[in-house]
């Protein structure tokens, strides 16, 4: 009997009957046995097959067969009901050997001329399975030349078995409050040889409670308490488990913030596992009852560790703890069963008593003393001296606690005080100085301080002067002493002001000339307006036409009188705007240098002279009734003349203030 | 961390007006809270000088109402003390506080002297 | 204004004894009373806020209670860093206002 060849020669070849392609003889039996690599099988397929044909191939036949499998008994030409003749069949082993026995009987009817196979070894596709066969390996398999190997999806790893896939199941942690955990794969078979351990890890004072749901399948045993596969769940207090089967288990109220469930598995079966709900409960806190005007948000049936609400006060309502303010508040539930927070009151807003206002006063409108929530009040001036400027002064107590105009504004009214009021009426006389009545120039300042000189007041806490007035005092503003509501110049009662600061045109130069020869002085305080002590108004844009030519200005101070000594009481004079094309002639004659006269000056006075502010006078305003708003403005500051005052042909010169509005507004709303 | 911050001078003379800043981290003042000053004087007596609330509304100790101004810078996260005409009794260590006290500056020593 | 009296200026105490700190208020401010510990050098510290919420890193033997008029601060196991003063304090109304402190020492 040949053997055939052995692995690890090549495995190929070819096989006939004995006398192929002639007839094979009576009472022959040949068997060849071949084998192949590990890993290899062998394939066998006839080119030629031609023996006779007996019921069930009892008398010759060739016969197939892989280890104690006989793979096929073949005879005749072709197949019939009952025997099989090879026709284009491949045949393989079931392993790496097949054995092929041909046999022959005692007679035959006619010749027949037998066989001829050929066959080679072939790798095995072991990842190849026939149906209803377990597959080869658990999740993945891959073939190769003489072998295979499986491997797993992700989550999964290769037990030492190298087919079973077993499940990376372990470590997984829940925090949350709440949440469902399964078998791996459910509701799909569970893996097999694998060791899962799933953790729920909550904060102390919360306990866990654990509901299987859906549907519930471990592999079990009639006898024998879960011995294959279980599911046990562990907290710090007992032990539940071990379980399995199919019938759903209880609710388990754990009592413990802690679980460990652990789900073991053996290498068979094919069960769907299980499915856990799990939810938390801890100590309730009291339930929040809401303060008066106020309200509790989120509400909910019961409030548990972490969980938490706000309060929201209606509008015109505010978070208050004790007397102290929150923009916000959130109270949180302890693991003891208390709240974190004490709960605030919901108190209306009080904006509290209104802030006095500078020389005004405030009304109580909706009620002596009612500063809550959309109470009203009403602001004024002190009437004829001072004028409301911004708003009507109608405040109201808004939701944020703020008293409120109706424009929006947070800040108090301001009361200006109003300017240009004097208790003269001009008469139009040009001649003759005259002694001021108390109210004619409640404007007028007196300056002491090295020289005696005079000022304009602006507003209630400037003055309005010449450079040359106070250039030496431009460093020690309070060496000024500042003098106001008094028509003697040396009465001891006055109105005392001091000097903050002094503000000298960047454009004079003393000693040069007096272009630009004016001052403002800011007050460390401001005045208090009466009808002595009144501004002067600046000129609007339409003052020039109070200034013509030979309209009459008026002239006020302390100045030099015709008797060559200071004023003991106020004096003014009413003098004429001098063309100014004259007044520059004037002035073009020595001892003047050329250009005396700028256009940054006015001149007012009379040809023949005699009407003249002079020395003392210096820094004063001249003053134009604005006959339109018959308020007096400055027009003037008196700043330099001939060496006589009063002289004829010569003109007092004066500031044109006009030119000046954009510096005085600047430097008043810069300080 | 909630920190605050006391600044100013150690020392002012009678009649003058004393400036404080209190300068807070970690927390903004207008999120939340009122913004205390409170001052302790020699022997431990503390008393409370009012406060700015996250708003900007202010509430004064009627004892001081007529020299005290609390105002707050909220780009700098600051707020200030401003109290006018001090005088010895004035002396004390200043301290800046949130809320009903739950964190306290470290302090300023205040001593009010010609 | 409402005072706050602290009747007892020092108190003596042992290490892991139980000490009441009290604070009267002269009307009623609720449950609005504050708590503070200071030690020399240092500024007041929170302990209690409310009557009877801790602040926020207090040990729990330092707890509180009371309303209305009458607050005790107890700490329930005096240790050697507890030996400080203790003032009580006020939020309930304007002005708020400070208890004149009680001083913890060694027996």
């Known amino acids: 009997t040949p053997l055939g060849p052995k692995w690890p020669e090549p495995v190929f070849g070819r096989l006939a009957s004995p006398g192929f392609p002639g007839e094979y003889a009576n009472d022959q039996e040949r068997r060849w046995t071949l084998t192949a690599p590990p890993g290899y099988r062998l394939r066998l397929y006839f080119t030629h097959f031609d023996l006779e044909l007996s019921h069930l191939c009892e008398y010759d036949f060739v016969k197939l067969s892989s280890g104690a499998k006989v793979l096929a008994t073949l005879c005749g030409q072709e197949s019939t009901d009952t025997e099989r003749a090879p026709g284009k069949d491949t045949f393989y082993s079931l392993g790496s050997s097949l054995d092929i026995t041909f046999r022959s009987d005692y007679s035959n009817e006619k010749p027949f001329t037998g066989f001829e196979a050929f066959y080679a070894a072939e790798d095995i596709d072991e990842c190849q399975v026939a149906p209803g066969e377990a597959p080869t390996c658990d999740h993945h398999c891959h073939n190769h030349l003489g072998g295979f190997y499986c491997s797993c999806r992700a989550g999964y790893v290769l037990h030492r078995n190298k087919r079973t896939c077993s499940a990376l199941c372990s470590g997984q942690v829940f925090t949350q409050r709440s949440g469902e955990l399964s078998s791996p794969e459910y509701p799909r078979p569970y893996p097999k040889l694998s060791s899962c351990t799933y953790s729920i890890s909550l904060e102390e004072g919360f306990s866990v409670i654990l509901d299987f749901v859906e549907s519930f399948d471990v592999e079990t045993h009639p006898e024998t308490l879960c011995p294959y596969d279980f599911l046990k769940i562990q907290t710090d207090r007992e032990e539940h488990g071990p379980f399995c089967g199919k019938t759903l288990p209880h609710r388990i109220e754990t009592k413990s913030n802690t679980v460990t469930i652990t789900f073991v598995t053996d290498e068979s079966g094919d069960h769907t596992g299980w499915k856990i709900h799990y939810t938390s409960t801890a100590q309730p806190c009291p339930y929040p009852m809401a303060p008066p005007n106020g309200h509790v948000s989120p509400v909910q049936a019961k409030y548990i560790l972490k969980d938490s609400f706000s309060i929201f006060c209606e509008t015109g309502y505010e978070l208050l703890q004790g007397h102290l303010p929150l923009k916000s508040f959130t109270a949180v539930c302890q693991k003891d069963g208390s709240w974190d927070r004490p709960m605030p009151a919901c108190s209306i807003v009080d904006c509290g008593p209104p802030d006095d206002l500078p020389s005004g006063r405030v009304e109580y409108i909706t009620g002596p003393g009612v500063t809550t929530y959309k109470a009203v009040i009403q602001y004024s001036c002190e009437e004829t001296f001072y004028t409301m400027k911004v708003n009507d002064g109608k405040y109201v107590c808004e939701a944020d606690g703020f008293w409120t105009s109706s424009k929006g504004e947070k800040s108090l009214p301001v009361c200006e005080p109003v300017c240009g009021l004097s208790a003269r009426t001009t008469g139009g006389r040009i001649y003759g100085g005259q002694k001021a009545k108390p109210g004619d120039f409640p404007w007028q300042v007196l300056i002491l301080g090295g020289t005696t000189a005079a000022g304009a007041l602006l507003y209630d806490n400037w003055v309005l002067t010449a450079a040359h007035a106070v250039y030496e005092q431009k460093h020690d503003a309070s060496a000024l002493d500042i003098r106001m509501g008094t028509l003697k110049r040396l009465s001891p009662h006055y109105t005392q002001a001091w000097s903050e600061a002094v503000f000298i045109h960047e454009g004079y130069t003393h000693d040069a000339g007096f272009d630009n020869d004016i001052a403002l002085i800011k007050l460390n305080n401001k005045v208090v307006i009466n009808s002595n002590i009144t501004p002067i108004c600046l000129p609007r844009k339409e003052a020039e036409s109070f200034m013509r030519t030979d309209d009459i200005g008026t002239a006020s101070g302390w100045g030099l009188t015709q008797r060559g000594f200071l004023a003991r009481n106020l004096m003014y004079v009413d003098i004429p705007i001098v063309d100014h094309q004259k007044c520059t002639a004037a002035y073009e004659k020595p001892p003047y240098p050329r250009g005396s006269v700028t256009a940054n000056m006015l001149c007012a006075g009379l040809e023949s002279g005699g009407k003249d502010s002079c020395r003392g006078d210096s820094g004063g305003a001249l003053v134009f009734l604005d006959s339109e708003t018959e308020r007096w403005f400055v027009g003037g500051i008196v700043s330099w003349g001939s060496m006589n005052c009063g002289e004829a042909g010569q003109y007092g010169v004066y500031t044109k203030v006009i030119n000046y509005i954009p510096w005085i507004e600047n430097i008043i709303s810069d300080f | 961390d909630v920190q605050l911050q006391e600044s100013g001078p150690g020392l002012v003379k009678p009649s003058q007006s004393l400036s404080l800043t209190c300068t807070v981290t970690?927390?903004?003042?207008?999120?939340?809270?009122?913004w205390n000053w409170i001052r302790q004087f020699p022997g431990n007596k503390l008393e409370w000088m009012g406060y700015?609330?996250?708003?900007?509304?202010?509430s004064y100790n009627p004892s001081l109402k007529s020299r005290i101004s609390i105002t707050r810078d909220t780009s700098k996260n600051q707020f200030f003390l401003q109290l006018n005409s001090v005088t010895a009794e004035d002396t004390a260590t200043y301290y800046c506080?949130?809320?009903?006290?739950?964190?306290w500056g470290q302090g300023t020593t205040l001593t009010v002297s010609s | 204004d409402i005072v706050m009296t602290q009747s007892q200026k020092f108190m003596s105490t042992s290490v892991g004894d139980r000490v009441s700190v009290t604070c009267k208020a002269s009307?009623?401010?609720?449950?609005?009373v504050a708590w503070f510990q200071q030690k020399p050098g240092q500024s007041p510290k929170a302990l209690i806020y409310?009557?009877?919420y801790r602040s926020s890193g207090v040990p729990d033997r330092f707890t509180g209670s009371g309303s209305g008029t009458d607050f005790t601060l107890t700490i329930s196991n005096v240790q050697s860093e507890d030996l400080a003063e203790y003032f009580c304090?006020?939020?309930?109304?304007?002005?708020?206002?400070f208890g004149g402190g009680t001083k913890l020492e060694l027996k």
């Open positions: 506080a949130r809320y009903w006290g739950d964190y």
């Open positions: 009307q009623n401010v609720g449950t609005n």
């Open positions: 970690g927390y903004s003042i207008t999120s939340d809270y009122a």
């Open positions: 700015i609330s996250y708003s900007g509304r202010t």
């Open positions: 304090q006020q939020f309930n109304s304007n002005p708020l206002t």
């Open positions: 409310s009557t009877s």
